[in-house]
C-alpha cells in the first residue's frame, strides 16, 4: 500500500502551432505547464530573450515551461525555439489574472513583493487548489511507512494552515520522530508510522476572510513478519535464439526491506554441487528492492553458454525465498525456432 501521494504531472497545455502568437491569462499563484516539442527533443524556452534554466521556480525543462506558482514578475513574453536552430515553435505572452493566490515558500528569495500591493486585489476566502490530490481520504498503511497528507490551498490574503489530530491541535511533540510541516507544500509528513498514529487528521486553512477544513483518516497496519513472497511462475522458463535479448522477471513482495540476487547455476569440475550440498552459482546481479529494475535480469545478445538455470533469490531479516527458471538457447538457423517460438522475451 502506498501511503505517500504519487507525484502527478499537471496536464500539459500545448498552445497550437497555428496560433504562434497568443496571449494567456494566468491567475496569480496558479501553476503553469506549457509544452513545446516532444519530451527530450523539446525546444528551449526563453523569457524576454534570456534562456530559462532547467531548475528553479520558473524553468524550461525537456520542452516544458513550468512555473510553480505564477507571480506578477512572471508576466511577459515567452519564446520556445527549436533545438539547434532559431525556429520559433511558440511565441506567447503571459498576462497576470486578477486573483491573488498563495505564494510558494520555495520561491526565489530575490522575488520580493510589497505586501501593500496585495490590497489592489480582491480578498478571497481560502479554497482548495488541487482537490483531485485530496480525493484519497482513507489511508491504511503498514507500520514503518511514511505518510503524507496534503491540503494545497490558496486565497487572499495568503492563508495559513494548521493541523489537528482527532480534533486537537497537532504539533507532533508527543510523537517519536516528530512530524514535518511543509507549509509551502501545504503538507504534513509523518515518518515511520506506528499504531498510535491512527486517527483523524484535519487540515485547517484560514485567512481573514474565511476558513476551510479537510479530514483524512489514517489506519496503521501492524506487520505480520514473513520472508519475501515471490510471485508464482516467475521467473519463467524461456527459450531464445542465439543473438537475441532475454528478460527474466522476478516479482518480490516483502514488508521488511528485501535484498535480491540473480544467480546463474554453474558447473565446476564436472559437478553442479559443492561438498556442502549447495549448488555452485555465479552472482549476476545484487541490489535492494528499491533499486531500479532489480526485479528484471537482462541478458543481451545471448549465446549457447548463457543457457542454463537462473535463480532469483530474495531475502529479508526473517528469511530467504527463491525460484528458478531455465533458459534454453537455440542456434540461429534452427527452423523450429522461427515456427514455434517467435517471441524471445518473457512479457508480464
Amino acid at each position: 500500500l502506498e501511503a505517500s501521494e504519487e507525484v502527478e504531472l499537471e496536464p500539459c497545455l500545448a498552445p497550437s502551432l497555428e496560433q504562434q502568437e497568443q496571449e494567456l491569462t494566468v491567475a496569480l499563484g496558479q501553476p503553469v505547464r506549457l509544452c513545446c516539442g516532444r519530451a527530450e527533443r523539446g525546444g528551449h524556452w526563453y523569457k524576454e530573450g534570456s534562456r530559462l534554466a532547467p531548475a528553479g521556480r520558473v524553468r524550461g525543462w525537456r520542452g516544458r515551461l513550468e512555473i510553480a506558482s505564477f507571480l506578477p514578475e512572471d508576466a511577459g513574453r515567452y519564446l520556445c525555439l527549436a533545438r539547434g536552430s532559431m525556429i520559433v515553435l511558440q511565441n506567447l505572452t503571459l498576462i497576470t489574472g486578477d486573483s491573488l493566490t498563495s505564494s510558494n515558500d520555495d520561491e526565489d528569495p530575490k522575488s520580493h513583493r510589497d505586501p501593500s500591493n496585495r490590497h489592489s486585489y480582491p480578498q478571497q476566502a481560502p479554497y482548495w487548489t488541487h482537490p483531485q490530490r485530496m480525493e484519497k481520504k482513507l489511508h491504511a498503511v503498514p507500520a514503518g511507512n511514511t505518510v503524507k497528507f496534503r491540503c494545497p490551498a490558496a486565497g487572499n490574503p495568503t492563508p495559513t494552515i494548521r493541523w489537528l489530530k482527532d480534533g486537537q491541535a497537532f504539533h507532533g511533540e508527543n510523537r517519536i520522530g516528530g512530524i514535518r510541516l511543509r507549509h509551502q507544500h501545504w503538507s504534513l509528513v509523518m515518518e515511520s508510522v506506528v499504531p498510535s498514529d491512527r486517527g483523524t487528521y484535519t487540515c485547517l486553512v484560514e485567512n481573514a476572510v474565511g476558513s476551510i477544513r479537510y479530514n483524512y483518516l489514517l489506519d496503521v497496519l501492524e506487520r505480520s513478519p514473513h520472508r519475501p513472497i515471490l510471485q508464482a511462475g516467475l521467473p519463467a522458463n524461456t527459450t531464445a535464439v542465439v543473438g537475441s535479448d532475454v528478460e527474466l522477471l522476478c516479482k518480490v513482495y516483502s514488508d521488511a526491506q528485501p535484498h535480491i540476487q540473480w544467480l546463474k547455476h554453474i558447473v565446476i569440475n564436472g559437478s553442479s554441487f559443492g561438498a556442502d550440498g549447495f549448488p555452485y552459482v555465479q552472482v549476476l546481479k545484487t541490489a535492494d528492492i528499491n533499486s531500479s529494475e532489480v526485479e528484471v535480469l537482462y541478458l543481451r545478445n545471448v549465446s549457447a553458454e548463457d543457457a542454463g538455470e537462473y535463480t532469483c533469490l530474495a531475502g529479508n531479516s526473517i528469511g530467504l525465498s527463491y525460484q528458478s527458471a531455465w533458459l534454453t538457447v537455440l542456434p540461429e538457423e534452427d527452423p523450429t525456432w522461427t515456427a514455434a517460438a517467435p517471441e524471445a522475451r518473457y512479457t508480464d
Epitope: 482537490p131 481520504k137 482513507l138 491504511a140 499504531p195 476551510i212 479530514n215 483518516l217 489506519d219
Partner: antibody, heavy 118, light 107 residues
C-alpha cells in the same frame, strides 16, 4: 468479483442481542475500511458504524453508541456487528458496505433484516 | 453534524424526460458527495462519487455536478430501469450522512 454477504438477522425481543456477520470475497478485505448502514422499513439510509482495516479505529452513530460493537476478523474475511440492548427502533435491514479509499461506499451486501419486537 | 437535504422528495416524470434531483449540505463538503440508487428490495448502488465521477458501469445519462453545498444529479433521458429512490451522501466528515431520498416515479 466483489461480494458481501450478510447473515445473522432475525427476530429478537427488546433488550436482547444479535450478532451480524458479513462475509467478504473478491477483494483484499484486510486493506479496506468497512461500514454498517441500516434502513428502517419504508425509511431512508442511516449509517451505523465503521471500522478501519486493522480494526484499530472504530466509530458509531450516536443512536447506537454504547450498545453496538463493530469488529472484524481479517483472517476470515469477515465483518461483525454485535448488537446489545436492542430497541424497537433498531428494527431495520442492515447492510455491510465497503468504503473505497475516498470514503464513498462502492459495494454493498444484500442486507439482513433485524426485527426487534415483543 | 452536517445535514443533507434532498429535493424534491418525489418526482413524477415520463420515460425520455430529463430528471434533475438536488441535494444541499448544511455546510461545505467540498466535492465529497456520492449518489446512490436503490430499487425496491435491493441494496443501494453507487452511481456517482466525488460529486461528478460516474462509478464503474454507470450509464452516461447519469451526470453529477456541484461543489461546496449545492449538488445535483441529472438523468438526461429517463429509462424504465431508472425509476427508484435516489440518495445523496456526504463523506467529507464523520459521521457520514445520507439525504432523506428522492423517489423518482413513472408519470
Amino acid at each position: 468479483e466483489v461480494q458481501l454477504l450478510e447473515s445473522g438477522g432475525g427476530l429478537v425481543q427488546p433488550g436482547g442481542s444479535l450478532r451480524l456477520s458479513c462475509a467478504a470475497s473478491g477483494f483484499t478485505f484486510s486493506r479496506y475500511f468497512m461500514k454498517w448502514v441500516r434502513q428502517a422499513p419504508g425509511k431512508g439510509l442511516e449509517w451505523v458504524s465503521w471500522i478501519s482495516p486493522s480494526g484499530g479505529l472504530t466509530e458509531y452513530a450516536d443512536s447506537v453508541k454504547g450498545r453496538f460493537t463493530i469488529s472484524r476478523d481479517n483472517s476470515k474475511n469477515t465483518l461483525y456487528l454485535q448488537m446489545n440492548s436492542l430497541r424497537a427502533e433498531d428494527t431495520a435491514v442492515y447492510y455491510c458496505a465497503r468504503a473505497s479509499y475516498g470514503a464513498w461506499l462502492d459495494y454493498w451486501g444484500q442486507g439482513t433484516l433485524v426485527t426487534v419486537s415483543s | 453534524d452536517i445535514q443533507m437535504t434532498q429535493s424534491p422528495s418525489s418526482l413524477s416524470l415520463s420515460p425520455g424526460e430529463r430528471a434533475t434531483l438536488s441535494c444541499r449540505a448544511s455546510q461545505s463538503i467540498n466535492r465529497n458527495l456520492g449518489w446512490y440508487q436503490q430499487k425496491p428490495g435491493q441494496a443501494p448502488r453507487l452511481l456517482i462519487y466525488g460529486a461528478s465521477t460516474r462509478a464503474t458501469g454507470i450509464p452516461a445519462r447519469f451526470t453529477g455536478s456541484g461543489s461546496g453545498t449545492e449538488f445535483s444529479l441529472t438523468i438526461s433521458s429517463l429509462q424504465s430501469e431508472d425509476y427508484a429512490i435516489y440518495y445523496c451522501q456526504q463523506y467529507d466528515n464523520w459521521p457520514i450522512i445520507f439525504g432523506q431520498g428522492t423517489r423518482l416515479e413513472i408519470k
